[in-house]
């Protein structure tokens, strides 16, 4: 999906008002210096691409974040404020076999959510030069 035509300001507002708090809640008890940010993004569409990938694609050691509150809110925000996103997801859902995943918070998931926090912060500061 191409995130170029999303309403970035509405997504930013959703992040600032609620998604950010859910990410902090998920990471509670973890030191902010515990993980190094290794995933970066260069502009808002790229940031949303990376955010979608890290939030919804299973990775080794972190099977699923999709049932977390921040993930539910992220998917809803993309569906509401990114034209055509819903259709791509409806088609993907119908094509995909159902797999039930247990919610397990592993260190790998914490690291992944730490990366997400960095991507969201970068999304909110699109005019900053890449380090």
């Amino acid at each position: 999906y191409d995130f170029t035509n999303c309403d970035f300001e509405k997504i930013k507002a959703a992040y600032l008002s609620t998604i950010s708090k859910d990410l902090i809640t998920y990471m509670s008890g973890t030191k902010s210096t515990e993980f190094n940010n290794t995933v970066s993004c260069s502009n808002r569409p790229h940031c949303l691409t990376e955010i979608q990938s890290l939030t919804f694609n299973p990775t080794a050691g972190c099977a699923s974040l999709a049932k977390e509150m921040f993930a539910m809110k992220t998917k809803a925000a993309l569906a509401i404020w990114c034209p055509g996103y819903s259709e791509t997801q409806i088609n993907a859902t119908q094509a995909m076999k159902k797999r039930r995943k247990r919610k397990v918070t592993t260190n790998k998931c914490l690291e992944q959510v730490s990366q997400l926090q960095g991507l969201w912060r970068r999304f909110n500061r699109p005019l900053l030069k890449q380090q």
Epitope: S17, T18, A66, K67, E68, M69, A71, M72, K73, K75, A76, A79, S86, Q89, I90, A92, T93, Q94
Partner: nanobody, 115 residues
Framework: EVQLVESGGGLVQPGGSLRLSCAAS????????MGWFRQAPGKEREFVSA???????YYADSVKGRFTISADNSKNTAYLQMNSLKPEDTAVYYC?????????WGQGTLVTVSS
Amino acid sequence: EVQLVESGGGLVQPGGSLRLSCAASGLTFSRYAMGWFRQAPGKEREFVSAIFSDGSTYYADSVKGRFTISADNSKNTAYLQMNSLKPEDTAVYYCARGPNWFDPWGQGTLVTVSS
């Protein structure tokens, strides 16, 4: 098995109001987010509103200020209060639930705004 059943649609004049209901079974309602999509004839399905268990809500620009989403956990029911309806609100309205949002779907309820 999760089932979502929408009701409350009908024919209403421009400027009128309707309240849609979505009764959910087969899930612990308060643990999930709920939302409403709509599909107008010949158009893509559009996500118009969502409500989350912490009370936060999202609205599409096209309905903000006119529609209000709410949920009653004790009744396992979500609502969409639609005020100041316009002809362009004519669509089949579907309720959906998080985390997936895109499955399962109910059968939908038709809202027609016409004079």
